[in-house]
C-alpha cells in the first residue's frame, strides 16, 4: 500500500530534533550559513545553504536527507533567489528555524 509522504518529512524532522537535543558544543564549530526565505522552495534553499558546511558530521545526515526533497543537483557555492540577501546565521540557529518551519508544514499537511 502506498505510504503517505508525511513519513519522509517526519524522518527529516526527527533528525533535526536529534541535532538540536544532542547539541553539546557549538554546532559545526559555530559555522555561519546564509539565512533563507522559508516561505517557498524551502528544501532546496536549505540544502543550498547547508551544503557549504563541510567537515561537520552532525549535519551530514540532514544534508543528505534534504537531497531527497529537492529535485535538482545542488553544489557548494550555488544559491537561489531564496537566500536572504547578505544575512548569515549560525548553523544551530538555522537548524532550529528550519525545524520550526518543517513542523508547521507537517501540521498543515504540506509534505512535498
Amino acid at each position: 500500500s502506498p505510504v503517505p509522504p508525511s513519513t519522509a518529512l517526519k524522518e527529516l524532522i526527527e533528525e533535526l530534533v536529534n541535532i538540536t537535543q544532542n547539541q553539546k558544543a557549538p554546532l559545526c564549530n559555530g559555522s555561519m550559513v546564509w539565512s533563507i526565505n522559508l516561505t517557498a522552495g524551502v528544501y532546496c534553499a536549505a540544502l543550498e545553504s547547508l551544503i557549504n558546511v563541510s567537515g561537520c558530521s552532525a549535519i551530514e545526515k540532514t544534508q543528505r536527507m534534504l537531497n531527497g526533497f529537492c529535485p535538482h543537483k545542488v553544489s557548494a557555492g550555488q544559491f537561489s533567489s531564496l537566500r536572504v540577501r547578505d544575512t548569515k546565521i549560525e548553523v544551530a540557529q538555522f537548524v532550529k528555524d528550519l525545524l520550526v518551519h518543517l513542523k508547521k508544514l507537517f501540521r498543515e499537511g504540506q509534505f512535498n
Epitope: A8, N67, F69
Partner: antibody, heavy 123, light 106 residues
C-alpha cells in the same frame, strides 16, 4: 542494526513465476524508497525496479517492464518483487536495497543492501 | 537509453593511486554514486553525491564529477581495496549502473 533479508529465490522454468520478499529490520522501511538490483553470474549490477517511499510510485527497467511488479506491505516492513514470464536472462542474484528518502529518493544513495537471493531460470 | 562507461580493469601497486573513470552524457549535471563489491559479497556504497564518503569509508576514497566524467580515486591503495567498482546515476526515471571496473592490487 539496519538489515534487509531477501527470500523467495529458487529454480523455475522459463515462463514461470516467483515472488521475492525483502524483510527490513532496524528502521521504518515505509519512510524510504526500496529497490531491487540484480547481478547475473559473472556480470555487472543491473537495477530492476524501485518503489518510492513518498506516494508509492513505481519504477522499472525496460528489460522487466510488464513482467515484474514491485510492491510493499508497510505493516510487515517488507518489499516484494513479483516476477512473471521469467526468461533465462533473468537468472541472477537479486539484491534488495534501502533507497533514499523523500519524493526525489534517487538523490540520496543506496545505503543498505541485503545479502541477495538467487533466481535460476532453466528448463 | 542512458549509458555509463567504465574501463574494464585498472591495476595499481600497493601505496599508489588508482583512478577509475565513469563516462556519461552530461554526467556532471547528475549526482554520481560509487559502489565497491568484493567477490561473494553485496555492494557497498563508498561515495555519494559525487564526492562525499559515508561513515566508515576510509579517507583514501575520494570522488569528483564534472562535464561528462565522474572519477573515483583511491589514494594509497591497499590490498583490501581489490574489488569491482561501479558508478551509478539516475536518468529519466531509471537508475543506471556503470559497466564496472575490476581493480587489481599488484
Amino acid at each position: 542494526e539496519v538489515q534487509l533479508l531477501e527470500s523467495g529465490g529458487g529454480l523455475v522454468q522459463p515462463g514461470g513465476s516467483l515472488r521475492l520478499s525483502c524483510a527490513a529490520s532496524g528502521f521504518t522501511f515505509s519512510s524510504y524508497a526500496g529497490s531491487w538490483v540484480r547481478q547475473a553470474p559473472g556480470k555487472g549490477l543491473e537495477w530492476v525496479s524501485a518503489f518510492s517511499g513518498s506516494g508509492g510510485s513505481t519504477y522499472y527497467a525496460d528489460s522487466v517492464k510488464g513482467r515484474f511488479t514491485i510492491s510493499r506491505d508497510n505493516s510487515k516492513n517488507t518489499l516484494y518483487l513479483q516476477m512473471n514470464s521469467l526468461r533465462a536472462e533473468d537468472t541472477a542474484v537479486y539484491y534488495c536495497v534501502q533507497d533514499g528518502l523523500g519524493p526525489y529518493f534517487y538523490n540520496y544513495g543506496m545505503d543498505v543492501w541485503g545479502q541477495g537471493t538467487t533466481v535460476t531460470v532453466s528448463s | 537509453s542512458y549509458e555509463l562507461t567504465q574501463p574494464p580493469s585498472v591495476s595499481v601497486s600497493p601505496g599508489q593511486t588508482a583512478s577509475i573513470t565513469c563516462s556519461g552524457d552530461k554526467l556532471g549535471d547528475k549526482y554520481a554514486f560509487w559502489f565497491q563489491q568484493k567477490p561473494g559479497q553485496s555492494p557497498v556504497l563508498v561515495i555519494y553525491h559525487d564526492s562525499k564518503r559515508p561513515s566508515g569509508i576510509p579517507e583514501r576514497f575520494s570522488g569528483s564529477n564534472s562535464g561528462d566524467t565522474a572519477t573515483l580515486t583511491i589514494s594509497g591503495t591497499q590490498a583490501m581495496d581489490e574489488a569491482d567498482y561501479y558508478c551509478q546515476a539516475w536518468d529519466s526515471s531509471t537508475y543506471v549502473f556503470g559497466t564496472g571496473t575490476k581493480v587489481t592490487v599488484l
